[in-house]
């Protein structure tokens, strides 16, 4: 009857026309909801002319459904076993699971004014560009929509600048009719042990971001993984939201609508510096704002996002070196709520829930040519706003899945 | 020492397009930003052009814009200015000059004179 | 433009200051003795001396304005000074339109 059974598991998920992981693979039959909660500052007039500790309040959940678009492109190549697509991007608000509308303001960092001298850091470029900063009447805060905020706004200062650049601006811009890919994808057709494992992203086997094996793409897009897990294996995924493969390890065992899941969490030693997990040494990419590489707990993708001074953490600023999170007031990291996990069917290796948490935080330094930043007497990791993605096995599908698979198994 | 040693200065036909060269030595010359300023007989002193340490941005002033391309070569240590569509009031000493950051000059060339004349 | 004196006038061993308004960043003060002569830098950014500028020449700057100090002029600082900067506009540096020192 194992046999069988594995025999059964083994066929079904080959990423290939026809199984039953191949359907749920192209267009996934979970509901997935992007929740966001936005850090309002409280203070800006305090911080920009006192350098004072910055006073946020976060205000959410405002809540988007995302990747209900099927996978496209989608070819198969018999040669390598492999299966490459892309993922297209797209969001509708949920106005019933929000505690406002798109059309809520928030006092945040101005994206622009605080990227504009860590992109340009020569003083003649700097000097030039704050007098169209003033010009604008642009200064270190402003106020924004959701909508402006997360998916763009035409920027009044950018707009001034004369030179080919774009000028929109947002933390997800371009977000809606784009694609995450070309992912090309192992199909497991020859080897069951590498189904879904990433053979290459945008053609290329390394991300160029990091140096050393950092720059590796390593397991899959987390949406399942090689079937028969072990509680002992780490699960290595990729996300591109964070520019970086990243692993899970096994927490505990959980049942999910009956059906026995191995819960796998993002451990602390990940987001480590490198003084207390060697192996980060590759993620740290910069010596100032990284206190020589002893801060821990946020992430520089700078080079992955145009030079723009982007750093992701965990919400709250969870598992980071209290350095970080000093000159910031409001903030309550907590475990539970902040955290990554996923669920993950072991037979099968399918995720059947997960909680994706990350912060998006913009890194703003003292500027002496930048007037509206001149005031500042030390470099803020700004945070901006934390997303909690979800996803859950539908009651429907569960029952279908008790009865072709962990029912047989019983 | 610092040196910025400036040519292609003489007289010019209007309508026509001049390049001004400056050769510098006895510094780092691809951490400066370079400007040139010109000097009309009897006049003040009239910002022309500026560039960055790697050429990636310019900037012109207003007489000037449109007809002049400020470019430089890291390699060879100089800066160049092309002056288009040459005006009678292009006419004076073209200086260049260095920036010691901010817009704040901190040496100058000796100068080469152009006459703008039918 | 940057607004500065057209003229000033002081006897030798006298200290003399120059103001400078109207600009946006930094500021340089130039000296040039004679009309086709190269200007020499004797302040950049606001106060600093090049090496081979006596200490007599001093620069320093507030808000919006600079002033530049000769402590104890003497008749070789005849010339005209020049101040430079930004005036906050997207046309290049601007200068003064010159003081002219006389050394009485």
């Known amino acids: 009857g194992d046999m069988l059974i594995e025999k059964t598991i083994k066929r079904e998920v080959v990423l290939e026309e026809g199984t039953t992981a191949f359907k749920n693979w192209v267009k996934t039959g979970t509901t997935v909801y992007r929740q966001f909660w936005i850090f309002d500052v409280q203070n800006p007039d305090d911080v920009a002319k006192n350098s004072s500790k910055i006073k946020v309040k976060q205000r959410g959940p405002y809540t988007y459904r995302v990747r209900y678009l099927a996978k496209e492109n989608i070819t198969q190549d018999p040669e390598d076993h492999t299966v490459s697509f892309v993922q297209p991007n797209g969001a509708i608000f949920e106005p019933s699971l929000s505690v406002g509308t798109e059309d809520d303001n928030f006092t945040v960092l101005n994206l622009a004014v605080a990227a504009a001298p860590h992109i340009y850091q020569n003083s003649f470029v700097q000097v030039v560009l704050n007098s169209l900063i003033k010009k604008s009447k642009s200064s270190m805060f402003q106020t924004r929509s959701l909508k402006e905020l997360l998916w763009g706004y035409k920027d009044p200062f950018l707009s001034l600048v004369p030179y080919p650049i774009s000028t929109t601006v947002g933390v997800f811009y371009p977000y809606n009719d784009t694609v995450d890919g070309v992912y090309k994808v192992f199909n497991g057709k020859d080897n069951i042990s590498k189904v879904a494992i990433i053979e290459s992203y945008k053609g290329k086997r390394n991300l160029s971001y990091w140096p050393s094996y950092c720059d590796m793409i390593n397991g899959t897009d987390a949406a399942s993984f090689p079937p028969f897990v072990e509680k002992s294996r780490t699960l290595r995924f990729f996300s591109s939201d964070i520019c970086r493969s990243i692993y899970a390890v096994f927490g505990s065992e959980i049942d999910l609508k009956g059906i026995p899941v191995y819960r796998f969490v993002l451990p602390a030693n990940a987001f480590a510096s490198p003084l207390q997990n060697p192996d980060n040494h590759c993620f740290c990419t910069e010596k100032v704002i990284s206190n020589n590489c002893t801060s821990y707990g946020v992430l520089d993708i700078g080079k992955c996002k145009e030079g723009k001074p982007v750093y992701i953490s965990l919400p709250h600023f969870l598992h980071a070196s209290p350095d970080v999170s000093e000159p910031i007031e409001g903030l309550h990291p907590n475990e539970d709520e902040h955290r990554t996990y996923l669920d993950v069917e072991p037979i099968t290796g399918f995720t059947l829930q997960f909680a994706k948490r990350l912060q998006v935080n913009i890194l703003v330094k003292p500027a002496r040519k930048i007037e509206a930043l001149k005031n500042l007497k030390r470099p803020y990791i700004v945070p901006i706003l934390w997303l909690n993605e979800t996803g859950t096995i539908g009651d429907e599908k569960a029952e279908m899945f008790k009865t072709q698979v962990t029912g047989k198994i019983k | 020492a610092v040196t910025l040693d400036e040519s292609g200065g003489g007289l010019q036909t209007p309508g026509r397009a001049l390049s001004l060269v400056c050769k510098a030595s006895?510094?780092?010359?691809?951490?400066?930003?370079m400007f040139w300023v010109r000097q009309a007989p009897g006049k003040g002193l009239e910002w022309v052009a500026g560039i960055d340490d790697d050429g990636s941005f310019t900037l012109y002033g207003a007489a000037v814009k449109g007809r002049a391309t400020i470019s430089r070569d890291n390699g060879q240590s100089t800066v160049r200015l092309q002056l288009n569509n040459l005006r009678a009031e292009d006419t004076g000493t073209y200086y260049c000059?260095?920036?010691?950051?901010?817009?704040?000059?901190?040496?100058w060339g000796h100068g080469t004179e152009v006459i703008v004349s039918s | 433009a940057l607004t500065q004196p057209s003229s000033v006038s002081a006897n030798p061993g006298e200290t003399v200051k120059i103001t400078c308004s109207g600009g946006?960043?930094?500021y340089g003060w130039y000296q040039q003795k004679s009309p086709g002569s190269a200007p020499v830098t004797v302040i950049y950014q606001n106060d600093k001396r090049p090496s081979d500028i006596p200490s007599r020449f001093s620069g320093s700057a507030s808000g919006s304005t600079a002033t530049f100090t000769i402590t104890g002029v003497q008749a070789e600082d005849e010339a005209v000074y020049y101040c430079g900067g930004w005036d906050g506009s997207y046309d290049g540096a601007v200068f003064g339109a010159g003081t002219t020192l006389t050394v009485l």
């Open positions: 946006d960043s930094d």
């Open positions: 000059a260095r920036d010691s950051g901010a817009v704040s000059i901190d040496a």
């Open positions: 006895g510094f780092t010359f691809s951490s400066y930003n």
